[in-house]
Amino acid sequence: QRFAQAQQQLPLESLGWDVAELQLNHTGPQQDPRLYWQGGPALGRSFLHGPELDKGQLRIHRDGIYMVHIQVTLAICSSTTASRHHPTTLAVGICSPASRSISLLRLSFHQGCTIASQRLTPLARGDTLCTNLTGTLLPSRNTDETFFGVQWVRP
Amino acid sequence: QRFAQAQQQLPLESLGWDVAELQLNHTGPQQDPRLYWQGGPALGRSFLHGPELDKGQLRIHRDGIYMVHIQVTLAICSSTTASRHHPTTLAVGICSPASRSISLLRLSFHQGCTIASQRLTPLARGDTLCTNLTGTLLPSRNTDETFFGVQWVRP
Amino acid sequence: QRFAQAQQQLPLESLGWDVAELQLNHTGPQQDPRLYWQGGPALGRSFLHGPELDKGQLRIHRDGIYMVHIQVTLAICSSTTASRHHPTTLAVGICSPASRSISLLRLSFHQGCTIASQRLTPLARGDTLCTNLTGTLLPSRNTDETFFGVQWVRP
């Protein structure tokens, strides 16, 4: 029992439990397909424990294997709307450093208005994750419809 | 190696590994949009280790950040059926205590017959999670098509 | 602080952090609906830490509760294509040993071109997971569109 107490007294950072859950702040300007995220208890149920935000993009602070998950819902959208607009695609990837640039997760909306997925991937300290939304429909900013997060799983 | 043995001898509860995976029991009466869940080894592959069921709703026993996930499939459904019965929406939220009531996760089926998603969210001991299905199509009770679960991730 | 260092010196295997993320290798021959997977750092961002591949199927090495996740995207697909080739279904299950054969996760594509889901399930050492894709559309081999993984969560 003493061990469990000792374990809880350790700073969580030393256990490597980096985790973040973000909500949509805004979309990028004309030629920038990136979504810009925000997080923190003042904003509701979003948070960052370990990772940080760098100009709205998520930067990793600890090497390891992470579970990356995302849901994006298009605003004012129906299956008819979706089919009447340019195909909307979401891609999550490492966008910096440039030497590690790669697409990790990609989904198209087709006639749907929401995409949601998750995957395990190795990430390194300093990796910045970008979420690129291409298409002409606006993503919802409702916090229960659009969110993005990572969870450190193991070294 | 001794440490690893010692760790495994600790009650898992002290490590905070609360986890549950539930299967659909039944839908609510006429004016009740909630899905009612069940879990336990006697039922198949569902289980509750830490959280409990309170009248078919999942109650959290340990504070922390949780990964909440859900999949719901509509029974006897095709894209034609789904579009004719639109809109069908699923929302997962904290429904009690009332002071903490909030929608955590929301998805519409549009022309599809299955929704699946997951997110990280802080939950507190005593929070009860409800899953509200609005629409006129019945959810499948097949255990590989409809399920709902939570996993404690960190304090 | 000494404890944290000691913990990190332990072999991760003893902590039970089995994890795998796989990419699609190929589909099966005519009468075999199974997808065949591959993993390893030489292939990109896929890996196996604990579980193993047995003829393209994932074999579990440690008893416990696992988070199983999958995303499959159909190649050269649009909502029109998908609806004309209906039904395409993906099922993840234990396929051996035969005595434990069961479907864990099932999704239909309907008018969409991607399915993605995840669930918690108990798995035992020796369980082999198979992913069966029925339908006439080929799955994409792009590593950001089609992947399959497991993560050990607790004993």
Epitope: L24, T27, Q30, T73, A75, I76, S83, R84, H85, H86, P87, T136, L137, L138, S140, R141, N142, E145 | - | -
Partner: antibody, heavy 119, light 111 residues
Framework: EVQLVQSGAEVKKPGASVKVSCKAS????????IHWVRQAPGQGLEWMGD????????SYNQKFRDRVTMTRDTSTSTVYMELSSLRSEDTAVYYC????????????WGQGTLVTVSS | DIVMTQSPDSLAVSLGERATINCRAS??????????MHWYQQKPGQPPKLLIY???NLESGVPDRFSGSGSGTDFTLTISSLQAEDVAVYYC?????????FGGGTKVEIK
Amino acid sequence: EVQLVQSGAEVKKPGASVKVSCKASGYTFTTYNIHWVRQAPGQGLEWMGDIYPGNGDASYNQKFRDRVTMTRDTSTSTVYMELSSLRSEDTAVYYCARFSRFDGWFAYWGQGTLVTVSS
Amino acid sequence: DIVMTQSPDSLAVSLGERATINCRASRSVSTSGYSYMHWYQQKPGQPPKLLIYLASNLESGVPDRFSGSGSGTDFTLTISSLQAEDVAVYYCQHSRELPYTFGGGTKVEIK
């Protein structure tokens, strides 16, 4: 640079039809919906409908549904708006317009085409 | 259809003074974390020009004396310091649902 260039002014008799063209340049034609908005002399703006050039699907304001047809020619990056059974109250300047990145508001406009319906 | 009511119909303001135009929607045009209200300026013989989108976002190239505010059903376009070149008709437009509709316009003149 995004440009929308419309066809010239038209004079039509009541009961006739008019077909106004809008030629797009400076961007990928099939990506962005083209909307049509009209303005009667000294009056406000009225949304008529839009077309997605990618597949030709159009959505019309219920007010014009029975009389308006929007089409596109991807080979010339041109959208057409045809209004039939013309009446005097259809006398207006007809604009084609395009949004910038997300649909819903119009950052680019054609120069307008005056359609006069008179017997 | 959502009806957009602009007020006043016309407005005379001295150069350098503030001009305020209101637009009321017959029902809320706010959803999904946005207010789907946009503002345009139109000068005689020209097509409308986008000034503000999503209630408060300034379109690129538009002077920052223009600003927008509001949510739900009530919205305001403000010109903080009227210039001679701001003489025009101003329209609000919603895109909450189809059909999109415009307000009747407000004519801004110099006093």
